[in-house]
C-alpha cells in the first residue's frame, strides 16, 4: 500500500511514542493472496 504525507496532522500526537512506522518485522508481512 501507499501513504502520502504532508496533509493533515498525525493521530499519534497524544502518545509519547513517535508516529513514524516501527521497524518492519515478519509479523507484518501481508498474507499471500
Amino acid at each position: 500500500s501507499e501513504t502520502t504525507t504532508g496533509t493533515s496532522s498525525n493521530s499519534s500526537q497524544s502518545t509519547s511514542n513517535s508516529g513514524l512506522a516501527p521497524n518492519p518485522t515478519n509479523a507484518t508481512t501481508k498474507a499471500a493472496g
Partner: antibody, heavy 118, light 107 residues
Framework: QVQLVQSGAEVKKPGASVKVSCKAS????????MGWVRQAPGQGLEWMGE????????TFNQKFKSRVTMTRDTSISTAYMELSRLRSDDTAVYYC???????????WGQGTTVTVSS | DIQLTQSPSFLSASVGDRVTITCRAS??????LAWYQQKPGKAPKLLIY???TLHSGIPSRFRGSGSGTEFTLTISSLQPEDFATYYC?????????FGQGTKLEIK
C-alpha cells in the same frame, strides 16, 4: 559494518526518468525502512519517502508522490528509487538512508548525483 | 508539515569554543529530534537522536537537549573536524522534515 552503496552519477534530459539503486550490507535488510533524501546544489535536505522492505508499503512526501517509484529486491538487499518527468530543478544529490524507529536515519549511502540538463 | 527553524544560519567560531545551535519546531515533536553533521561532498552523519541520545561512535563533546518545540545542539569544545553544516530533523511524524541548516565556519 552497515554499508549502503549507491549507483553512479547520471545525466538526464528534461522529461526523462532516472533510477537510483542502493545496495545494503552488514545488517538485515528487511529489518529497517529505507528512506530517500535529496539535496539540491547548495541547498538543504529534503525527505522524499520510504519503503518497508518486507511489505513494500511506501510512505511519500506529497511533493513527490506523482513522480517517484520506490521498489526493492530483498534477494539482493537492494532498494531503488525512480523519479520520472525530470526537470532542471531535480538536479541534486540523492541519498538512500536506513531508518531505524528509535534512532531515525542512522546510516546513509554515499549519494548519487543526478544532473538534468538539455 | 512540521517546520523546523534553525538559528543561527551561519556561525563563526574558533577551535576550543563552545557553540550552541537552536532548532525550533512549528508544533510539538515531543523528544523526537535528530541532529546531523554534513561536510562538503559527503553524506550527512547522525550525531544525536531522540533529542539527547548520542549515536554510536560520536564524541561526548556533542550534546543535545530539549523537548516539545525547542531543542539545542551544543559542542563543548570545538575541534578542527567539527567545522561543517549541521541539520536538525524531526522523527515524530510524517513527512520527515529537516531544518535549513547551520554552517559552522572557522573564525
Amino acid at each position: 559494518q552497515v554499508q549502503l552503496v549507491q549507483s553512479g552519477a547520471e545525466v538526464k534530459k528534461p522529461g526523462a526518468s532516472v533510477k537510483v539503486s542502493c545496495k545494503a550490507s552488514g545488517y538485515d535488510f528487511t529489518g529497517y525502512h529505507m528512506g530517500w533524501v535529496r539535496q539540491a546544489p547548495g541547498q538543504g535536505l529534503e525527505w522524499m519517502g520510504e519503503i518497508n522492505p518486507i511489505t513494500s508499503d511506501k510512505t511519500f512526501n506529497q511533493k513527490f508522490k506523482s513522480r517517484v517509484t520506490m521498489t526493492r529486491d530483498t534477494s539482493i538487499s537492494t532498494a531503488y528509487m525512480e523519479l520520472s518527468r525530470l526537470r532542471s530543478d531535480d538536479t541534486a544529490v540523492y541519498y538512500c538512508a536506513r531508518r531505524d524507529y528509535g534512532t531515525s536515519l542512522d546510516y546513509w549511502g554515499q549519494g548519487t548525483t543526478v544532473t538534468v540538463s538539455s | 508539515d512540521i517546520q523546523l527553524t534553525q538559528s543561527p544560519s551561519f556561525l563563526s567560531a574558533s577551535v576550543g569554543d563552545r557553540v550552541t545551535i537552536t532548532c525550533r519546531a512549528s508544533k510539538s515533536i515531543k523528544k523526537y529530534l535528530a541532529w546531523y553533521q554534513q561536510k562538503p561532498g559527503k553524506a550527512p552523519k547522525l550525531l544525536i537522536y531522540a533529542g539527547s541520545t548520542l549515536h554510536s561512535g560520536i564524541p561526548s563533546r556533542f550534546r543535545g537537549s530539549g523537548s516539545g518545540t525547542e531543542f539545542t545542539l551544543t559542542i563543548s569544545s570545538l575541534q578542527p573536524e567539527d567545522f561543517a553544516t549541521y541539520y536538525c530533523q524531526q522523527h515524530n511524524e510524517y513527512p520527515i522534515t529537516f531544518g535549513q541548516g547551520t554552517k559552522l565556519e572557522i573564525k
